[in-house]
């Protein structure tokens, strides 16, 4: 199976961790599949929920992925780049705040450029409840990590804000920032940020980034 949509269509309709393999590749990755939300078939490419995993990682770690697919993890830029360049994918970002609210941003077309182009993010067609303007800057930026500064700032956004992300200068979002527990989650410049939902300084309780083929 190349993604969770294929897993779903094969008859496996239970949430859980599945092994995925890209066509013409022997390399396997373990990904969490959400088979319930919005019709199922979602491949989870990022999840934050409790601060149990350190997201201040190197370029190589963000490339290959890290964490626990059943909990907090990053699937890996290389796999996502290859997958999203084979067909059109949508990206859904699900967010939770500390007051019990949930929101989402859905992009009609999402893909990552290759590593040679620094896994630049490409997004089109925003809808959803987490802001009328995209909190991931458009046009998309290159990916940056603590050891690979590809942002548009004279500062080093990844070091300053922590975590790897498609930083602008530094931009209105960072879902891979520091995890702050409840009552410590406000006025944090380096937290888990989605500006056009919660504004400046608010660090979110939970985030999930998930992809699925368009027209699934």
């Amino acid at each position: 199976f190349r993604d969770c949509a294929e897993v779903f269509k094969s008859g496996h309709t239970t949430n859980g961790v599945y092994t995925l393999t890209l066509p013409n590749s022997t390399e396997e990755v373990k990904a969490y599949c959400d088979m319930e939300a919005g019709g199922g078939g979602w491949t989870i490419i990022q999840r934050r929920e409790d601060g149990s995993v350190d997201f201040q990682r190197t370029w190589k770690e963000y490339k290959v992925g890290f964490g626990n697919p059943s909990g907090e993890y990053w699937l890996g830029n290389e796999f996502v780049s290859q997958l999203t360049n084979q067909q059109r994918y949508v990206l859904k970002i699900h967010l939770k705040d500390w007051e019990g609210n949930e929101a989402y941003s859905l992009y009609e077309h999402f893909y990552l450029s290759s590593e040679e182009l620094n896994y630049r993010i490409h997004l089109k067609g925003l809808t959803g409840t987490a802001g009328k303007i995209s909190s991931i800057s458009q046009p998309g930026n290159d990916f940056s990590t603590k050891d690979a500064d590809n942002d548009k700032c004279i500062c080093k956004c990844s070091q300053m804000l922590t975590g790897g992300w498609w930083f602008d200068a530094c931009g209105p979002s960072n879902l891979n920032g520091m995890y702050y527990p409840q009552r410590q989650n406000t006025n944090k410049f380096n937290g888990i940020k989605w500006y056009y939902w919660k504004g400046s300084g608010y660090s979110l309780k939970g985030t999930t980034m998930m992809i699925r083929p368009a027209g699934f």
Epitope: H109, L123, K124, G125, L126, I133, P139
Partner: antibody
Framework: SEHLVESGGGLVKPGGSLRLSCATA???????MSWVRQAPGKGLEWVGS????????YLNTKFIGRFTISRDDSKNTLYLQMNSLRAEDTAVYYC?????????WGQGTLVTVSS | AIYMHQEPSSLSASVGDRVTITCHGS??????VAWYQQKPGKAPKLLIF???FKVYEVPSRFSGSGSHEDYTLTISSLQPEDFATYYC?????????FGHGTKVEIK
């Protein structure tokens, strides 16, 4: 913004026609787009908007029958066809991304209607 | 069409001053109001939307407030680069309509 670039403006006689173009970055493919105009020394006036696939069009009632909005997503281009032009249509015409409000604007193209 | 009555049409102020611009809609607008800044020869720039939500890159001295029919743009401490014309816009109803603008000039 280099992501929205208008062209096609110029001098036209009253009663004449003009087609304005707006070359858009491809990330606007799924977005509503609008035309907004501004007469010299005056305020902003919304002309109309068009949905991503061009299936929904909204035109300010004062332009119905004279102006038409269209788009060609294969060319990443937005158009404003203006017919029966009048002196009072003299303005800078901007294309903009329409989220209800306008968060991306082109640099504008000047249309002058004069005999 | 909804009429957006913007006041004042112009004002003179000094650097450091607090500036307030108001817009009154002819009908209930549900906070679907935006504010723009425009400098001569340039396209407008979005500052505020949904009545009070500041665009990320916009300095914190700009703020929006209001409800129902009445909305306000405030510049808490005017800076040299803030001298420009400001417009409100309602997007609750078609046709979208703008206020006539407020020109902020140097005193």
């Amino acid at each position: 913004s280099e992501h929205l670039v208008e062209s096609g403006g110029g001098l036209v006689k009253p009663g004449g026609s003009l087609r304005l173009s707006c070359a858009t970055a491809d990330f606007f493919e799924y977005d509503d787009m609008s035309w907004v105009r501004q007469a010299p020394g005056k305020g902003l006036e919304w002309v109309g908007s068009i949905s991503p696939k061009g299936d929904h069009k909204y035109l300010n009632t004062k332009f119905i029958g004279r102006f038409t909005i269209s788009r060609d997503d294969s060319k990443n281009t937005l158009y404003l066809q203006m017919n029966s032009l009048r002196a009072e249509d003299t303005a800078v015409y901007y294309c903009a991304r329409d989220v209800g409000f306008f968060d991306w604007w082109g640099q504008g193209t000047l249309v002058t209607v004069s005999s | 069409a909804i009429y957006m009555h913007q006041e004042p049409s112009s004002l003179s102020a000094s650097v450091g001053d607090r500036v307030t611009i108001t817009c009154h809609g002819s009908y209930w607008l549900n906070s679907e109001v935006a504010w723009y800044q425009q400098k001569p020869g340039k396209a407008p720039k979005l500052l505020i939307f949904d009545g009070d939500f500041k665009v990320y890159e916009v300095p914190s001295r700009f703020s929006g407030s209001g409800s129902h029919e009445d909305y306000t743009l405030t510049i808490s401490s005017l800076q040299p680069e803030d001298f420009a014309t400001y417009y409100c816009q309602q997007y609750r109803y078609h046709p979208y309509t703008f206020g006539h603008g407020t020109k902020v000039e140097i005193k």
